[in-house]
Interface confidence: medium
């Protein structure tokens, strides 16, 4: 199937998320506190259309703050 450049799907999406999120984990949909029910998930945003590093980073898990 045709995919425009700069789109990410499947294993390639997971691999890139691990890189962008520096192994700290990530969400496939943003936490509910940061988005409403109708917000897109990362597959829709990055596989069905193009996305950039800044958008990918919004799906990274938030690191715990130092005590």
């Amino acid at each position: 199937a045709y995919r425009p450049s700069e789109t990410l799907c499947g294993g390639e999406l997971v691999d890139t998320l691990q890189f962008v999120c520096s192994d700290r984990g990530f969400y496939f949909s943003r936490p509910s506190s940061r988005a409403n029910r109708r917000s897109r998930g990362i597959v829709e945003e990055c596989c069905f259309r193009s996305c950039d590093l800044a958008l990918l980073e919004t799906y990274c898990a938030t690191p715990a703050k130092s005590e």
Epitope: S5, E6, T7, T16, D23, R24, K65
Partner: antibody, heavy 115, light 105 residues
Framework: QVELVESGGGLVQPGGSLRLSCAAS????????MSWVRQAPGKGLEWVSY????????GYADSVKGRFTISRDNSKNTLYLQMNSLRAEDTAVYYC????????WGQGTLVTVSS | DIVLTQPPSVSGAPGQRVTISCTGS????????VHWYQQLPGTAPKLLIY???KRPSGVPDRFSGSKSGTSASLAITGLQSEDEADYYC?????FGGGTKLTVLG
């Protein structure tokens, strides 16, 4: 045996362009993301750019965004870095590195930007 | 932004144990996987420790990594002259400033 061999470095004037190559062998090339990492003379390591294993996604350090372009040819097992609008601060040894953990590195190629 | 801080230099005599620290300043390093690289003089970096404490094949067990709180550490036991090198910690895209290890004598 995994081998990464960079080429294409040299002396270039400020504002000029250069294209680096990284030829890979000894592993399934199309299964690994790749990055370019650079090291200015006497300085530490700085990540420059990343490309996903199919080449669908690219990412850049802020210092090179809009000037450098990473690409790969999975039929030739080769990684590229097109560097435009070069500045003196881009002078460095440029390494290609495999995967998301940089588990293998090439020997590096020196890029000198000077008038 | 993530900042990883390493001591500029450490030293030790042959046979001794030395440690190199890597401290995260903007967020808890405990949530990240830390990798360590060794760069011998005039050569390319080499992966030494990945995912905090794992050793790639071929790396002697004299090298070990650990992580606690906001800091990660690389320990080298039974120091040898060939260990003299620069050592870098990283969280994937971000590298520490590097630590120069000098083996005395």
């Amino acid at each position: 045996q995994v081998e990464l061999v960079e080429s294409g470095g040299g002396l270039v004037q400020p504002g000029g362009s250069l294209r680096l190559s990284c030829a890979a062998s000894g592993f399934t090339w199309s299964s690994f993301a790749m990055s370019w990492v650079r090291q200015a003379p006497g300085k530490g390591l700085e990540w420059v750019s990343y490309i996903s294993y199919l080449g669908s996604y690219t990412g850049y350090a802020d210092s090179v965004k809009g000037r450098f372009t990473i690409s790969r040819d999975n039929s030739k097992n080769t990684l590229y870095l097109q560097m435009n609008s070069l500045r003196a601060e881009d002078t460095a040894v440029y390494y290609c590195a495999r995967g998301t953990k940089f588990d293998y590195w090439g020997q590096g190629t020196l890029v000198t930007v000077s008038s | 932004d993530i900042v990883l801080t390493q001591p500029p230099s450490v030293s030790g005599a042959p046979g001794q144990r030395v440690t190199i620290s890597c401290t995260g300043s903007s967020s808890n390093i405990g949530t990240y996987d830390v990798h360590w690289y060794q760069q011998l003089p005039g050569t390319a970096p080499k992966l030494l420790i990945y995912s905090n404490s794992k050793r790639p094949s071929g790396v002697p067990d004299r090298f070990s990594g650990s992580k606690s709180g906001t800091s990660a550490s690389l320990a080298i036991t039974g120091l040898q002259s060939e260990d003299e090198a620069d050592y870098y910690c990283s969280i994937t895209r971000v590298f520490g400033g590097g630590t120069k290890l000098t083996v005395l004598g």
